[in-house]
């Protein structure tokens, strides 16, 4: 004969565990039903009655099968430097990610707690590694024969124009100035822009250190105080 299917609540056999989507209630000493995502336990089970579930209220959620007495609060609204990539529903928390031109300077389990603008490389420096959703731009000094005259998070160092006759030699932050005869270039003229990064889920990678001659252009240092706790409002 097939084994009888037990309906919740039921007392488990000694040494056995409750089934999937059930939990063992210590008070009732019974296997009881969990609540589905989007719900929470309104009334816990007893020896004779199963868990009573209720829907999560607005701005609260449960993502997993559970027996929590209250749903979790959705995170605060996304700030102006963020975009909401997942709305707060009864079954999922709100997820905020950084808007274009910004990156995540302080991450949390899902999404981002704090966005900061991508580093801008100043004149004489160009982008060595473009920023991503989770990592800042890395700047490098323009090598001899190249320059950048912009403060930008996308411009790389460009070659100096090659003059038949040089009026003013170029340097790291200025292009060469030619006399009236037509110059030639080893690259197409105009600022070279790196594309803004598309949304990625890549892990934060350590940038290669800049040469010692290049000052750090990061807004951001070595061990100390930690960020405020989520939802903290201070003393």
């Amino acid at each position: 004969l097939p084994a009888q299917v037990a309906f919740t609540p039921y007392a488990p056999e000694p040494g056995s565990t409750c089934r999937l989507r059930e939990y063992y209630d210590q008070t009732a000493q019974m296997c009881c039903s969990k609540c589905s995502p989007g719900q929470h336990a309104k009334v816990f089970c007893t020896k004779t009655s199963d868990t009573v579930c209720d829907s999560c209220e607005d701005s609260t959620y449960t993502q997993l099968w559970n027996w929590v007495p209250e749903c979790l609060s959705c995170g605060s609204r996304c700030s102006s430097d963020q975009v909401e990539t997942q709305a707060c529903t009864r079954e999922q928390n709100r997820i905020c990610t950084c808007r274009p031109g910004w990156y995540c300077a302080l991450s949390k389990q899902e999404g981002c707690r704090l966005c900061a603008p991508l580093r801008k490389c100043r004149p004489g420096f160009g982008v060595a590694r473009p920023g991503t959703e989770t990592s800042d731009v890395v700047c490098k000094p323009c090598a001899p024969g190249t320059f950048s005259n912009t403060t930008s998070s996308t411009d790389i160092c460009r070659p100096h124009q090659i003059c038949n006759v040089v009026a003013i030699p170029g340097n790291a932050s200025m292009d060469a100035v030619c006399t009236s005869t037509s110059p030639t270039r080893s690259m197409a003229p105009g600022a070279v822009h790196l594309p803004q990064p598309v949304s990625t889920r890549s892990q934060h990678t350590q940038p290669t250190p800049e040469p010692s001659t290049a000052p750090s252009t990061s807004f951001l240092l070595p061990m100390g105080p930690s960020p405020p706790a989520e939802g903290s409002t201070g003393d």
Partner: nanobody, 117 residues
Framework: DVQLVESGGGLVQPGGSLRLSCGGS????????MSWVRQAPGKGLEWVSG????????DYADSVKGRFTISRDDAKNTVYLQMNSLKSEDTALYYC??????????WGQGTQVTVSS
């Protein structure tokens, strides 16, 4: 150990001014960029302003542009935030923060700014 200590917060009327200071110790202050970040009551963290290590580039959130000015004095290991034309929406706990490789990992305890009439 790295330490960041903010001061200068307080109660001010709308339209008024305050100057926040953040002193750093335990690291080579002049080698690092610094940021100001705020948290309004019941809201998330908001990046406010930043300054590069040599002071050559400063940047501001749109909400404070033209009203706030960030500066630094490496001789005093201090970064400042001059806040003018304050509005009620500037009420928040203001943190000084910094970090390596673009991560804001190191924070002060914060200084409270309340804008109210």
């Amino acid at each position: 150990d790295v330490q960041l200590v903010e001061s200068g917060g307080g109660l001010v009327q709308p339209g008024g001014s305050l100057r926040l200071s953040c002193g750093g110790s335990g690291f080579t202050f002049s080698s690092y960029g610094m940021s100001w970040v705020r948290q309004a009551p019941g809201k998330g963290l908001e990046w406010v302003s930043g300054i590069y290590d040599d002071g050559s580039v400063t940047d501001y959130a749109d909400s404070v542009k033209g009203r706030f000015t960030i500066s630094r004095d490496d001789a005093k290991n201090t970064v400042y935030l001059q806040m003018n034309s304050l509005k009620s929406e500037d009420t928040a706990l203001y943190y000084c923060a910094t970090g390596e490789d673009g991560e804001l990992n190191y924070w002060g305890q914060g200084t409270q700014v309340t804008v109210s009439s």
